[in-house]
Amino acid sequence: PTGAVEVQVPEDPVVALVGTDATLRCSFSPEPGFSLAQLNLIWQLTDTKQLVHSFTEGRDQGSAYANRTALFPDLLAQGNASLRLQRVRVADEGSFTCFVSIRDFGSAAVSLQVAAPYSKPSMTLEPNKDLRPGDTVTITCSSYRGYPEAEVFWQDGQGVPLTGNVTTSQMANEQGLFDVHSVLRVVLGANGTYSCLVRNPVLQQDAHGSVTITGQPMTFPPEA
């Protein structure tokens, strides 16, 4: 061989929403006279080299990864070795290597970043009645089934960040999606609005919730 096969993948991670299909792009430049009988294509998990999908001996050997992968057979001869991953799960996140062997061999790794949007936060107060200025209340902001872990920000009605007395916990469910609960302890003024922002750092998606206290009684803004 005069030089090893050049395998090209995107530099940036592929972002896929949970439950959707993702395409992990990979290409190589076939030489004139190239035939699929010469191609050995292996997709594998980068970390372990565990087989995901392969094309060898002139045919698609199928998925070795929960039967959720497919190649683009009509495009292989043109050097398109991309992999389709169906019904993406949190557990799929990570690096995949595209290994191409013709007369020589080469590989490149592409990262899959999984994401799921967070739900609109629900707000609860404790205590939630007979509130007076000077009372200490606990405001809880809860948002569900997002990925990856959220960033949570609190602010008052004037947009001033509230960073003290905030406790945030995030718990993953069996699918790996996170439920976030953030608790703000605050001493009430005469009136005020307290807002919570739950940000998905990958999707750059913000979910907002707020509660307004105007003397008595309290009001919650209507759901959007």
């Epitope: 096969v5 050049e6 050995n40 007369r103 080469g106 590989s107 790794a109």
Partner: antibody, heavy 124, light 109 residues
Amino acid sequence: QVQLVQSGAEVKKPGSSVKVSCKASGGTFSNYAINWVRQAPGQGLEWMGGIIPGFYSLNYAQKFQGRVTITADESTSTAYMELSSLRSDDTAVYYCARDQVVATSGVNFGMDVWGQGTTVTVSS
Amino acid sequence: DIQMTQEPSLTTSPGGTVTLTCRSSTGAVTTSNYANWVQEKPGQAPRGLIGGTNKRAPGTPARFSGSLIGGKAALTITGVQPEDEAIYFCALWYSNLWVFGGGTKLEIK
């Protein structure tokens, strides 16, 4: 347990060629690449090239391009490395080492098994 | 050409902990470089200790561990034994070729 067993020491004249063999005993070449690595006296390790016998494909380090030929015989689980136009600075110990292409066990051990080495001396 | 940098030599004491590193001229080392660590003792063939960044080869004692630290491949030996005195080479995969570092001579005093 797989072992890589290499051919014996060679003394060669400058300008000649040497062919070193590496036989896998106790296992096959399946799912593996066989790499050739050399070490000149007092120097570090240097990768020369590798072959994937099951895929009939191979790569060479640019430095050795045109001077090294790596082949394999799957039927005997033996890989070969031939170096031509020998010079005195090719005097070295030549090693073969296997590396997983696909980790059937789900664990990538890398270049876990090495041959015992073949000393090649180039001298007039 | 890709250059790889290892500490030329390190000295440690029996029972101590030592970390050897491997830096690449191309930038941060990642899992797709499949960092390997190879041990070589005088008069012996090299022995593969770690593959795939952090996978111990069969027979490698648990005191050897591989990782990525600050963009470099690293080999940590915890509870160093006298028999660990050797030269340690890292090797990184770059798409279609292996590149070896210059080696670190580990001395046990």
